[in-house]
Interface confidence: low
């Protein structure tokens, strides 16, 4: 009405879904008296009187709001119970004495929707698309107000982006009166979007204040070509002969293209096609210097039938050749000199050591051994080690005997056995020599003879203890063409006195073998009390 | 090299509406940037108001959302920013910048330029 | 949302000099770092947490884990002494900056 001073801002309100929102109505005393009050609800500007308060009691209006009002704080106070999103709308009350005046209230309602739901597109983007296509649909259902939709790109919100990001949104209004929201982000995509998480979120108020919820996160299948393709060989590093090696192929593109793996042929100069397994990998086991040479993938895309190369690779599979020692059976007499020369190929530069077998004493440090004023002693086996010292684990060796021309030399000269009478005795007797000796005994029993190396023996002899052994003993006599040698064993009977030997004596039932190497003693089944040795 | 220019005018009465406008030169600002406005009271700290994007999207701060405007102007290569019902309290520099692609952050700034809210 | 900093930090040339930016779940967030001196515009000195734009020293570095984001100066120059702001960014806040720090190279 023109001259009529303009209304005030209505009182705001603001209530869940489902509960109770409390009108109180703002007239002080001097604007009417609360005890004689209309309240009316205005919709699309249509006042409908819904509540009457006369002389502090009230009464609803017949129509939609008749089982929900109530009066509250003696009268002042409307209560209006299990709120719907179309209670949203300005309450009025006005009083009606002293004279006619009114108070607005602005009721508003929220409800927060349910999570929201996201579904990819599942057929997949491809990258060339000339327009954005659908990535994901969002859907969130039964909120008040409409929610807001932000779209998320790996936690980034996007926004629009003209002829690349497009989010279509529309709502529906369900039969309560809420909101389902249905949002579909359509998008231009590109390559470095293959791993890219898309999510939506709903951002919505509550009387509390600002509130979200998140959906999952999706990725989307994107295509793109292969633009490029690669060998790919594992290990990394160093290979040598004997390594499990696969060598695969890689593209950039999804889906990958057919891919095959070949090998030029050294002598025509060609590609070969090489034997993958199933998945595409041509594994190697064990490699081998053959194995070396030039290796591409051809990447096939049977959509585009376009075929894309590789960058060639050079595969080297290193090695160490059989190794070759000279003179391969040295025979030397005592006292002479011996040069011992080592040698072997590989694809790398070598280092040569020299090694005595027995001890694993290194003698020499490259690929000559030169042994001078031979003794019977050095007599046995030298290694030859050619190693590649960049690639650990990289060797070959050769084992060569030196054979030291002499007589008969015993582990031991004489040594004295314990032993029980009528027990069946295992002794044993080891000799060496160049030619290599043979051992007799002096007494019968089951003798068995097994050759250590080629300048050693030993022999094994079970017999029973009886009275006569024990006043003979045993001797074993080692021959060859330079001579003989014995050892004599001397056999004594076990008492108490022998089970407790003193500190300097130790005892025994083991069996073990005595030899010039091991530096042992001869052995018995039982306890024995070993003597230093003595070399004949 | 990109550079931004802020420009408009230095004195705004209070109650009024202050007006600056950011000409982007070196760069279209049709890339997927958004373009933002910051200012800085003498001798406080930085506050963002708002940001637009080249289809005219806009973002702005929640306690200013309702005294602010961005447009943009893709064929002057410009953005501007409006805020309404000035007080002393909006006297600040006032930048333009730029938000790195893919990145919540401001690669690019303007000089800034001082407005003062007085009558 | 709010990002707090000490109001000051002094260090001497050549030491480290660490500034904290401390706020809700600021981890969660992408916090990045500006330097201005007197008179100047904000230069960028770390993105997305530890990035480090073009043309800003290696001696810059950031983290961000928790609720604190940590802007780190080794080796610092008298040329660095200037004020720092960091800044973060999420759905709800938008943009925050954090209320800067006042850096001296004694």
């Known amino acids: 009405v023109p001259g009529e001073a303009e209304q005030p801002a209505p009182e705001l309100v603001e209530v869940e879904v489902g509960s109770t929102a409390l009108l109180k109505c703002g007239l002080s005393q001097s604007q009417g008296n609360l005890s004689h009050v209309d309240w009316f609800s205005v919709h699309k500007e249509k006042r409908t009187l819904i509540f009457r308060v006369r002389q502090g009691q009230g009464q609803s209006e017949p129509g939609e709001y008749e089982q929900r009002l109530s009066l509250q704080d003696r009268g002042a106070t409307l209560a209006l119970t299990q709120v719907t999103p179309q209670d949203e709308r300005i309450f009025l009350c006005q009083g009606k004495r002293p004279r006619s005046q009114e108070y607005r209230i602005q009721l508003r309602v929220y409800k927060a929707p349910e999570e929201p739901n996201i579904q990819v597109n599942p057929l997949g983007i491809p990258v060339n698309s000339k327009e954005p296509e659908e990535v994901a649909t969002c859907v969130g259902r039964n909120g008040y107000p409409i929610p807001q939709v932000i779209w998320y790109k790996n936690g980034r919100p996007l926004k629009e982006e003209k002829n690349r990001v497009h989010i279509q949104s529309s709502q529906t209004v369900e039969s309560s009166g809420l909101y389902t929201l249905q949002s579909i982000l359509k998008a231009q995509l590109v390559k470095e979007d293959k791993d890219a998480q898309f999510y939506c979120e709903l951002n919505y108020r509550l009387p509390s204040g600002n509130h979200m919820k998140e959906s999952r996160e999706v990725t989307v299948p994107v295509f793109y070509p292969t633009e490029k393709v690669w060998l790919e060989v594992e290990p990394v590093g160093m290979l040598k002969e004997g390594d499990r090696v696969e060598i695969r192929c890689l593209a950039d593109g999804n889906p990958p293209p057919h891919f095959s793996i070949s090998k030029q042929n050294p002598s025509t100069r060609e590609a070969e096609e090489e034997t993958t397994n199933d998945n595409g990998v041509l594994v190697l086991e064990p490699a081998r210097k053959e194995h070396s040479g030039r290796y591409e993938c051809q990447g096939l895309d049977l959509d585009t039938m376009i075929s894309l190369l590789s960058e060639p690779q050079e595969l080297l599979v290193n090695y160490v050749s059989d190794v070759r020692v000279s003179p391969a059976a040295p025979e030397r007499q005592e006292g002479s000199s011996l040069t011992l020369t080592c040698e072997a190929e590989s694809s790398q530069d070598l280092e040569f050591q020299w090694l005595r077998e027995e001890t694993g004493q290194v003698l020499e440090r490259g690929p000559v051994l030169q042994l001078h004023d031979l003794k019977r002693e050095a007599g046995g086996g030298y290694r030859c080690v050619a190693s590649v010292p960049s690639i650990p684990g990289l060797n070959r060796t050769q084992l060569v005997n030196v054979a030291i021309f002499g007589p008969p030399w015993m582990a031991f000269k004489e040594r004295k056995v314990w032993v029980k009478e009528n027990m069946v005795l295992n002794l044993s007797c080891e000799a060496s020599g160049h030619p290599r000796p043979t051992i007799s005994w002096n007494v019968n029993g089951t003798a068995s003879e097994q050759d250590q190396d080629p300048q050693r023996v030993l022999s094994t002899l079970n017999v029973l203890v009886t009275p006569e052994l024990l006043e003979t003993g045993v001797e074993c006599t080692a021959s060859n063409d330079l001579g003989k040698n014995t050892s004599i064993l001397f056999l004594e009977l076990v008492n108490l006195t022998t089970l407790t030997p003193d500190s300097n004596t130790t005892t025994g039932l083991s069996t073990s073998t005595a030899s010039p190497h091991t530096r042992a003693n001869s052995t018995s089944t039982e306890r024995k009390l070993p003597e230093p040795e003595s070399r004949g | 090299q990109l550079q931004l220019q802020e420009s408009g005018p230095r004195l705004v009465q209070p109650s009024g509406t202050l007006s600056l406008t950011c000409v982007v030169s070196?760069?279209?600002?049709?890339?997927?940037?958004?373009w933002s406005w910051v200012r800085q009271p003498p001798g406080e700290g930085l506050e963002w108001i708002g940001e637009?994007?080249?289809?005219?999207?806009?973002t702005y701060k929640p306690s200013l959302k309702s005294r602010v405007s961005m447009t943009v102007d893709t064929s002057k290569n410009q953005f501007s920013l409006n805020l309404t019902s000035v007080t002393a309290a909006d006297t600040a520099v006032y930048y333009c910048?730029?938000?790195?692609?893919?990145?919540?952050?401001?690669?690019?700034w303007g000089q800034g330029t001082l407005v003062t809210v007085s009558s | 949302y709010e990002l707090t900093q000490p109001p000051s930090v002094s260090v001497s040339p050549g030491q480290t000099a660490s500034i904290t930016c401390s706020g809700d779940?600021?981890?969660?967030?992408?916090a990045s770092w500006y330097q201005q001196k007197p008179g100047q515009s904000p230069v960028l000195v770390i993105y997305?947490?530890?990035k480090r734009p073009s043309g800003i020293p290696e001696r810059f570095s950031g983290s961000n884990s928790g609720n604190t984001a940590t802007l780190t100066i080794s080796g610092t120059q008298a040329m660095d002494e200037a004020d720092y702001y960091c800044?973060?960014?999420?759905?709800?806040?938008?943009?925050?900056f954090g209320t800067g720090t006042k850096l001296t190279v004694l």
């Open positions: 800044q973060a960014w999420d759905s709800s806040t938008l943009y925050v």
């Open positions: 779940k600021l981890g969660d967030k992408y």
């Open positions: 910048a730029r938000e790195a692609v893919g990145a919540a952050d401001f690669d690019y």
């Open positions: 070196g760069a279209s600002i049709t890339t997927p940037n958004w």
């Open positions: 997305q947490d530890s």
């Open positions: 637009v994007y080249h289809s005219g999207s806009t």
